[in-house]
Each structure stands twice: as C-alpha cells, then as structure tokens.
C-alpha cells in the first residue's frame, strides 16, 4: 500500500506537472495571430483514455514534437529557455509518475496543441482531486 509520504510525493509531482503544462498553455495563448494560426495546424496524438498515471507514457511520447512546435513559435533566435525548461521538467516528472510498467499507447485522435495541453491539464486536475478526496 502507498505510504503517506509517497502519496504526498506523487501529489507534489502532479502539482509540478500541472504547473508546467499551464505555463506552456499560457505561452501558446500569448502568441500573435499569425503564429498561433500556424501552431494550430500542427496535430498531436491523444490516447483513447487518460485515467491512470501509466497513461502519462502517451504524454512522454509527444514531448519531442511538442518542444519542436513550441520552439518554432517562440522564434528560433530567442533561446526558448522557458519552453526547454518546462519540457525538461515535464519529462522528469512524467518519468517519476508513470512508473516502470511498460504501457502501449493506443492513439485515438489528433488534436491541436491547445486541446492537447488542455486535456493533459484536465487529467492532472482529476487525479489531484481524486487523490485529495
């Protein structure tokens, strides 16, 4: 059974993941029209269901294209520090949260970057609220 300390650690990691995803979404929503319209043509894969921590494997698999697209929009001349830092944080946190069990993602649909980030934010929020109730 999970100890209170491991539950607390998981909670903190979910809070961190939620925060990093929100930072990325805020950045996307701040782009000017021409950049945002281009960004919205990129598609990201969403799995059939995201209800358990092991499903974070599916987020991990999309981090490389996500970083590419965010760097494009940020402008290749700016060093993309915020994006890189957030993606790196997400990568580390996801590795901790998803556990060692291998999970094969079954992708159901493609969505825009805004929808992609929103869905993973919702996932974090639902796990956080379930574990705190």
């Amino acid at each position: 059974a999970p100890t209170s300390s491991s539950t607390k650690e998981t909670q903190e990691q979910l809070d961190q993941l939620l925060l990093d995803l929100q930072v990325l979404l805020k950045g996307v929503n701040d782009y000017k029209n021409s950049k945002l319209s281009r960004m919205l043509t990129f598609k990201f894969y969403m799995p059939k269901k995201v209800t358990e921590l092991k499903h974070l494997q599916c987020l991990e698999e999309e981090l490389k294209p996500l970083e590419e697209v965010l760097n494009l929009a940020q402008g290749k001349n700016s060093h993309g520090g915020n994006t890189r830092e957030s993606i790196s944080n997400i990568n580390v946190t996801v590795l901790k949260l998803k556990g060692s069990e291998t999970f094969m993602c079954e992708y159901d649909e493609t969505v825009t970057i805004v929808e992609f980030l929103n869905r993973w934010i919702t996932f974090c929020q639902s796990i956080i609220s379930a574990s705190s109730s």
């Epitope: 021409s34 950049k35 281009r38 043509t41 990129f42 598609k43 294209p65």
Partner: antibody
Framework: QVQLVESGGGLVKPGRSLRLSCAAS????????MSWVRQAPGKGLEWVAM????????YYTDSVSGRFTISRDNSKTTLFLQMDSLRTEDTAVYYC??????????????WGQGTLVTVSS | DIQMTQSPSSLSASIGDRVTIPCQAS??????LSWYQQKPGKAPKPLIF???DLETGVPSRFSGSGSGTDFALTISSLRPDDFATYYC??????????FGHGTKLEIK
C-alpha cells in the same frame, strides 16, 4: 539539425516520367507540411505542390495539376514527387522544402540543395 | 492568383550602403510575406517571415517591414556577402503560393 536531401533528377524525354525523392532528417517529419518548389534555369522560384502532415491534403500549381503527384512515406521520413507526361517547360532545379506548419498558411523555413530535372528530346 | 511585383529587377549599391528592396502584392495579404536570399548555384535562404520576423541566425542588419500590399526588405549596411538575388513570397492565398520575380543586388 534539419536536413533535406533530394534525389532522382536527371535527363528525360518529353512525355516520359520521373520520380523525385527527398530524405528528411533532424525533425519530426510526420508533423510538418512539405512542398516542392522549382526554379527553371536563370528564372525565379515557382511553388509546385504541397502535402499536409498526414498526406490527407495535396495541392498543386495549375501547370502541373493532373500530371504531377506529391506523396509522402512518414515511416521512412521521405517526400516524393511523381512527374508524368513531362514537358520541356518542366526543366528546372526541384527543391524539397519544409513549412513550419502541419497544413495551411506557412512559408518555407528549410530547403534542400535541389535536384536538376532536364526534359529534352 | 495574387501577383507579387518586385521592382527594380536589379539594384546597384556599394559596401556600407543602406538598401531597401520593395515588394508589392496585387491584393491584401496581411503580413503573410517572407523574404529569401539566393546566391548562384545555391538553394534560397530564408531571411524574414510574417513580414518582419527575422529567421534563425540572420544578421540584424536585415529587417522587413510592411503589411497589406506594400512590403520592403532593408539591409542597413551592406556587406560583401549580401550581394545576391532577393525574392519575396506570399503565403496568404493558400495554397496558391506565389513568389516575386526577384531583385538582383549588384556591386556598384
């Protein structure tokens, strides 16, 4: 780093066919729209064809529509241009180019080195 | 299709000069315009996108301006490496992308 390497160009007689390939590396190929742009000797640039990230949409300039077919193999990160019923006016250097978008409004941010197609009898 | 007019077709200038290369669209293209530099035997190199945003690694002496139908590429102080042909390109009339015929920048 992003690399686009074209191949398949050469000398061909009018009415014949040729297939150009473009091997892409250094980026997540299956997320980006790709195009072919050509340049006749001593002339300006002309957009030829475009394909969306998943191959679902293809677009052509009027002069090649019905003769050229753009396609892609995302598993092999390769772009193709099948050119049929070639005409002398198709003689040009053909560039493989990437757009920083999955589809829709976009410029060209990376270009290959080009492959020369010469159509002559 | 939208026509892109680049006039003059050639331009002579000296090292250190400030040079402006105009480009005109036949109809409103918002800021959906890019600029490319091409040297003989080489592929075009992207310089500017969205009318005024500088591409990766492009020196700050290059700048783009304009919106709607009238655009310009400015080189603030010409260097020997800048002598080349410059093309503007509209990507507003999707997917009928069109390029200008180019302006060749030559040494005076």
């Amino acid at each position: 780093q992003v690399q686009l390497v074209e191949s398949g160009g050469g000398l061909v007689k009018p009415g014949r066919s040729l297939r150009l390939s473009c091997a892409a590396s250094g980026f997540t190929f299956n997320r980006y729209a790709m195009s072919w742009v050509r340049q006749a000797p001593g002339k300006g640039l002309e957009w030829v064809a475009m394909i969306s990230f998943d191959g679902g949409n293809q677009y052509y300039t009027d002069s090649v529509s019905g003769r050229f077919t753009i396609s892609r193999d995302n598993s092999k990160t390769t772009l193709f241009l099948q050119m049929d019923s070639l005409r002398t006016e198709d003689t040009a250097v053909y560039y493989c180019v990437r757009s920083p978008a999955g589809d829709w409004v976009a410029y060209f941010d990376y270009w290959g080195q080009g492959t020369l197609v010469t159509v002559s009898s | 299709d939208i026509q892109m007019t680049q006039s003059p077709s050639s331009l002579s200038a000296s090292i250190g000069d400030r040079v402006t290369i105009p480009c005109q669209a036949s109809e409103d293209i918002s800021n959906h315009l890019s600029w490319y530099q091409q040297k003989p035997g080489k592929a075009p190199k992207p310089l500017i996108f969205d009318a005024s945003d500088l591409e990766t690694g492009v020196p700050s002496r290059f700048s783009g301006s304009g919106s709607g139908t009238d655009f310009a590429l400015t080189i603030s102080s010409l260097r020997p490496d800048d002598f080349a042909t410059y093309y503007c390109h509209q990507y507003h009339d999707y997917p009928s992308y069109t390029f200008g015929h180019g302006t060749k920048l030559e040494i005076k």
